[in-house]
């Protein structure tokens, strides 16, 4: 396990190669999630922010940027879409939840949550999975699209088994996360693939 | 195996410090964090705070932050727990435990130090 | 700080027995609970890890279920080298915390 604290992997260039594996040996599937990082972008294309795809399963769970202003989040290939006003180009804590049991989903923006919305009420999201920053993975582990690459920085990344309530939410953007159990930024096991540099986190 | 071996029991005087080491072999101690736990006589355990090897980066319980140093030695794959302004309830064993690869659980422990703090 | 409440903090029970021990939480905790097994003058050794979870090597007849505030261990059939004491540790929260243990003795 590396400890990231204070540090980004930067990924300095559009590509259709350069990205991270981060690997978790997580043995059960998901009812209940909440994700959170920081990212550093100048894009204003779209691009994938987290990739967590299954065997035989495109867009399982994914964090996609379709333009400023508008974060969706994938669950078993469904899609919903949240818009909130920022500033651009910006750094950005993102945090994004989802509870199978309401099919709620609800993405947080710089600590304020943006309008819940619903999606795949009672499915639960497939385990063993193949988790990609940097691209966008069209199947298990590969098949990546240099429109849909992430150019820019990611840190801080955490992920728990479980919708974290307001007050976590807001300990994580405000740099004092919990312990997670899915992954943590403190204890990460991660490939570099390609042409991806950690460099100090400089812009919180 | 993997393995951590700690230093030997110590006797100290309230108000001064004590420094307790553990030794890890049979992995990469660069790779994973070091807990340090304390047991009084007869109680339960009690988590101090953590430390990773690599980064330097701590944790430590409020209870103990003001009073408890971790520290590692890279070159020895040695860690180490400074607790000052002992008083008699600091009186314990205190063991280093390995974070387990799975999550924030500790799957190795050393055998324990007794720390005796008497007049 | 979560506090961990262990019961009973002792029982006394014969080889072959089923026994349970329970861990009750102060808060929400999720499933992020290990518990481990001390004898006299050792240091603990983990046996479950998030609430159910055995660990490698450990035996089938210790099992752990339970999740948000209330977690068991179950032994289904007590052996003479399992008489020892029990902790119920939460990693869901620093700083991180331990029941007050549960102490098995042989009845």
């Known amino acids: 396990h590396t400890d990231l604290s204070g540090k980004v992997f930067v990924f300095p260039r559009e590509s259709v190669t350069d990205h991270v594996n981060l690997i978790t040996p997580l043995e059960k599937p998901l009812q209940n999630f909440t994700l959170c990082f920081r990212a550093y972008s100048d894009l204003s294309r779209a691009y994938s922010l987290f990739s967590y795809n299954t065997q035989g399963r495109d867009n399982e769970l994914l964090v996609y940027k379709e333009r400023v202003g508008e974060y969706s989040l994938y669950i078993g290939r469904h899609k919903v879409t949240s818009k909130v006003i920022e500033k651009f180009p910006a750094p950005v804590h993102i945090c994004v939840s989802w509870e199978s049991s309401s099919g709620i989903a609800e993405f947080w923006i710089n600590g304020t949550p943006l309008v819940k919305k619903g999606l795949r009420q009672g499915y639960f999201v497939e385990a063993q999975p193949k988790i990609v920053l940097g691209q966008e993975q069209d199947s298990y582990g590969g098949k990546f699209d240099r429109s849909q690459s992430f150019v820019g920085e990611i840190g801080d990344l955490y992920m728990w088994d479980s919708v974290l309530p307001p007050e976590n939410i807001l300990s994580a953007y405000q740099g004092t996360p919990l312990p997670a159990n899915i992954l943590d930024w403190q204890a990460l096991n991660y490939e570099i693939r390609g042409y991806v540099i950690i460099k100090p986190l400089v812009w919180v | 195996q993997v393995q951590l071996v700690q230093s030997g029991a110590e006797v100290k005087k309230p108000g001064s410090s004590v420094k307790v080491s553990c030794k890890a072999s049979?992995?990469?101690?660069?790779?994973?964090?070091m807990h340090w736990v304390r047991q009084a006589p007869g109680q339960g355990l009690e988590w101090i705070g953590m430390?990773?090897?690599?980064?330097?980066?701590?944790n430590y319980n409020e209870k103990f932050k003001s009073r408890a140093t971790l520290t590692v030695d890279k070159s020895t794959s040695t860690a180490y727990m400074e607790l000052s302004s002992l008083r008699s309830e600091d009186t314990a064993v205190y063991y280093c435990a390995r974070r387990n690869d799975y999550y924030w659980y500790f799957d190795v422990w050393g055998q324990g130090t007794l720390v005796t703090v008497s007049s | 700080d979560i506090q961990m409440t262990q019961s009973p903090s002792s029982l006394s029970a014969s080889v072959g027995d089923r026994v349970t021990i329970t861990c009750k939480a102060s808060q929400n905790v999720n499933s992020n609970v290990a518990w481990y097994q001390q004898k006299p003058g050792k240091a603990p050794k983990l046996l479950i890890y998030s609430a159910s979870y055995r660990y490698s090597g450990v035996p089938s007849r210790f099992s752990g279920s339970g999740s948000g505030t209330d977690f068991t261990l179950t032994i289904s059939s007590l052996q003479p080298e399992d008489f020892a004491t029990y902790y119920c540790q939460q990693a869901n929260n620093y700083p991180f915390t331990f029941g007050q243990g549960t102490k098995l003795e042989i009845k």
């Open positions: 049979g992995y990469t101690f660069t790779s994973y964090w």
């Open positions: 430390i990773h090897p690599n980064s330097v980066n701590t």
